[in-house]
């Protein structure tokens, strides 16, 4: 991961703003505050962005090198099944759970976990780099 | 140094419209999601909308949807709220705020416009 | 939504005094909160967000802190120019919330 211009100067990542940090095509940015899910999917929306939906395997894993103990909120809910916000079903990683009452889904370093949507957690935004 | 500058408030009847405006100097406008609040003449303080930097997105609480806009012009860096079917209960100062940009609420603030609705 | 309740609602002190001003949350809101100052024309300035963090200009004798769901702006030694308003802000939860106000009176 690249960070923005704000922290960077390098040729290879100029282009996502300053706060955000870029990975391939995309820019993420990794909260410092914590929001409960709705919340979290406001603040996205509100800086032209989404609520973290990770596409593979392999932006999981990196995402997941760049993350910490402490969990955030992605674009995950269970509607009838686990799906990102965008509706297309979680099918390359499962999901921890311990209640049918924990239906938002956040990352850690370490796994997907489902938890209650009023819980205040960091959370990461998603957005295609200009 | 960041200035929000609020213009359009008025009396106006019940059912009636209204625009307001809100001028941003000292800051990047474009970088910022931008919000309206309210104070009623009770004192008591109301979020009534935001909108995304771009302006593709806005939200509203529930008792103002569908009688209240949020829009923006980047290129003027201005904000607007268009306002109608105006009750008795929209009656109150209305300020332009910046949204923090770690997600800390409103960091900045307007000095306001008044709006009164009353036949 | 989340309720604030901001006591006391009015608040009598001398020149010099300490005060504290308190919101409670109706349930978490980790340490989402601001506190606002508002002047008697109308302005509003925040002083302190993410619960005791002072914004930049804001003189030392504010103060904020957490106990649970309560949060408390704390004034060390109170100046004539601080007997104006003062509201809290949760923004963990939407909608944004705020407290009632405290108005803030010179004995």
């Known amino acids: 991961l690249c960070q923005g211009s704000k922290y960077s100067t390098c040729a290879s990542c100029p282009s996502c703003p300053d706060h955000w940090m870029k990975y391939g095509n995309h820019c993420y940015y990794f909260s410092v505050e914590k929001k409960d899910w709705i919340s979290s999917l406001e603040f996205c929306l509100a800086r032209d962005s989404h609520l973290l939906m990770i596409t593979d395997k392999q932006e999981m894993s990196l995402l997941q090198d760049f993350l910490s103990e402490a969990f955030h909120w992605v674009g995950l809910r269970n509607n009838s099944g686990w799906r990102w916000e965008d509706g297309s079903p979680l099918n390359f990683s499962r999901i921890y759970s311990n209640s049918l009452v924990q239906t938002c889904g956040a990352i850690n370093k370490n796994s997907l976990q489902a938890s209650s949507c009023e819980v205040s957690l960091q959370w990461v935004c998603k957005k295609v780099s200009p | 140094e960041v200035q929000l500058v609020e213009s359009g408030g008025g009396l106006v009847k019940p059912g009636g419209s209204l625009k307001l405006s809100c001028t941003a100097s000292?800051?990047?406008?474009?970088?910022?999601?931008m919000s309206w609040v309210r104070q009623t003449p009770e004192k008591r303080l109301e979020w009534v909308a935001t909108?995304?930097?771009?302006?593709?997105?806005?939200n509203y609480p529930d008792n103002v949807k569908g009688r209240l806009t949020i829009s923006r012009d980047n290129a003027k860096n201005n904000l607007y709220l268009q306002m109608s079917l105006l009750k008795s209960e929209d009656t109150a100062m209305y300020y332009c705020?910046?949204?923090?940009?770690?997600?800390?609420?409103?960091?900045?603030w307007g000095q306001g416009t008044s709006v009164t609705v009353s036949s | 939504g989340i309720q604030m309740t901001q006591s006391p609602s009015s608040l009598s002190a001398s020149l010099g005094e300490r005060v504290s001003l308190t919101c409670r949350a109706s349930r978490d809101i980790g340490s989402s909160l601001n506190w606002l100052q508002q002047k008697p024309d109308g302005t509003i300035k925040r002083l302190i967000y993410?619960?005791?963090s002072l914004d930049s200009g804001v003189p030392k004798r504010f103060s904020g802190s957490r106990s649970g769901t309560d949060y408390s702006l704390t004034i060390s030694s109170l100046e004539s120019e601080d007997f104006v308003d003062y509201f809290c802000?949760?923004?963990?939860?939407?909608?944004?919330?705020f407290g009632g106000g405290t108005k803030l009176e010179i004995k």
């Open positions: 000292g800051f990047t406008f474009r970088n910022y999601a």
């Open positions: 993410a619960t005791s």
């Open positions: 802000l949760q923004y963990a939860s939407s909608p944004w919330t």
């Open positions: 909108i995304s930097e771009s302006g593709n997105y806005n």
């Open positions: 705020v910046r949204d923090d940009w770690e997600g800390r609420a409103m960091d900045y």
